[in-house]
Interface confidence: low
């Protein structure tokens, strides 16, 4: 099966590249996951997204666990997922009425 992901191979500053022009078709039977990398720097939040093989993505995300501290300067987080466009924007929380 072919999966679609958001892809921006160069780091984007304060742009999570989750718009339609960043959608790509991943390589069948090779790239079976979507990957998202988030780096928090003094200039802002850097995003990089791509298709990935499950092996490569899981190695990367495991290796960076100790550097992932969301909200902290120099935090680096890598996440992997395996559904179409799953490395897109996080769903907005609905306000409670």
């Amino acid at each position: 099966l072919q999966i679609q992901c958001y892809q921006c191979e160069e780091f984007q500053l304060n742009n999570d590249c989750s718009s339609p022009e960043f959608i790509v078709n991943c390589t069948v039977n090779v790239q079976d996951m979507c990957q998202k990398e988030v780096m928090e720097q003094s200039a802002g939040i850097m995003y990089r997204k791509s298709c990935a093989s499950s092996a490569a993505c899981l190695i990367a995300s495991a290796g960076y666990q100790s550097f992932c501290s969301p909200g902290k300067l120099n935090s680096v987080c890598i996440s992997c997922c395996n559904t179409p466009l799953c490395n897109g924007p996080r769903p907005k929380k609905r306000g409670s009425s």
């Epitope: 191979e9 160069e10 990398e37 780096m39 490569a56 190695i59 990367a60 290796g63 960076y64 550097f67």
Partner: antibody, heavy 122, light 107 residues
Framework: EVQLVESGGGLVQPGGSLRLSCAAS????????IHWVRQAPGKGLEWVAR????????YYADSVKGRFTISADTSKNTAYLQMNSLRAEDTAVYYC???????????????WGQGTLVTVSS | DIQMTQSPSSLSASVGDRVTITCRAS??????VAWYQQKPGKAPKLLIY???FLYSGVPSRFSGSGSGTDFTLTISSLQPEDFATYYC?????????FGQGTKVEIK
């Protein structure tokens, strides 16, 4: 299959120049970083230089700064190490290597070439 | 530059032995340490990255631990193909630096 093949080594006189090549296959160098690491005969490993071909960022060891230049041609999927003003202490086997987790502090070199010997002697 | 000091510089061991190699960084490098194996005339091979993560295809008898300044590579049961030289490397700062190597020889 990922492969790195170095070439260009040989015997050169002190003060001379050489250009080493590192031809990559099985992956695109623009999605990674390429390092050169050297090993003098009977000695340990010494990092020399690094390039990130996607943005052209380069780093050098102090021992080679100003004499060596690392570059890459993404259309040929090849990295280069131009070595000028060579000294006897530059004699070593030169390896190119690919990194994983390249963009942060946890990178490591997962694929290495077979090495090419550079001998600087008169 | 960060100094990486390995000990011992060499050791003799027998097949089946548990072998431990240590690496000390001159300053805190978090978990940014890799371990490589090198055999004579060959390129180094990656064993461990991020201090404790086993690289793909590496036998599970190899393990790494540590953070900060003190790191360990352990071979739980030495096999004939493990006789080689082992290097640690820090990637926390540029320039990256290697330990001087530990040669594991047959007793």
């Amino acid at each position: 299959e990922v492969q790195l093949v170095e070439s260009g080594g040989g015997l050169v006189q002190p003060g001379g120049s050489l250009r080493l090549s590192c031809a990559a296959s099985g992956f695109t160098i623009s999605s990674s970083s390429i390092h050169w690491v050297r090993q003098a005969p009977g000695k340990g490993l010494e990092w020399v230089a690094r390039i990130t071909p996607s943005d052209g960022t380069t780093y050098y060891a102090d021992s080679v700064k100003g004499r060596f230049t690392i570059s890459a041609d993404t259309s040929k999927n090849t990295a280069y190490l131009q070595m000028n003003s060579l000294r006897a202490e530059d004699t070593a086997v030169y390896y190119c290597a690919r990194c994983i987790l390249c963009f942060g502090p946890l990178w490591a070199m997962d694929y290495w070439g077979q090495g090419t010997l550079v001998t600087v002697s008169s | 530059d960060i100094q990486m000091t390995q000990s011992p510089s060499s050791l003799s061991a027998s097949v089946g032995d548990r072998v431990t190699i240590t690496c000390r960084a001159s300053q805190d490098v978090s978990t940014a340490v890799a371990w490589y194996q090198q055999k004579p005339g060959k390129a180094p091979k990656l064993l461990i990255y991020s201090a404790s993560f086993l690289y793909s295809g590496v036998p599970s008898r190899f393990s790494g631990s540590g953070s900060g300044t003190d790191f360990t590579l352990t071979i739980s049961s030495l096999q004939p193909e493990d006789f080689a030289t082992y290097y640690c490397q820090q990637s926390y700062t540029t320039p990256p630096t290697f330990g001087q190597g530990t040669k594991v020889e047959i007793k």
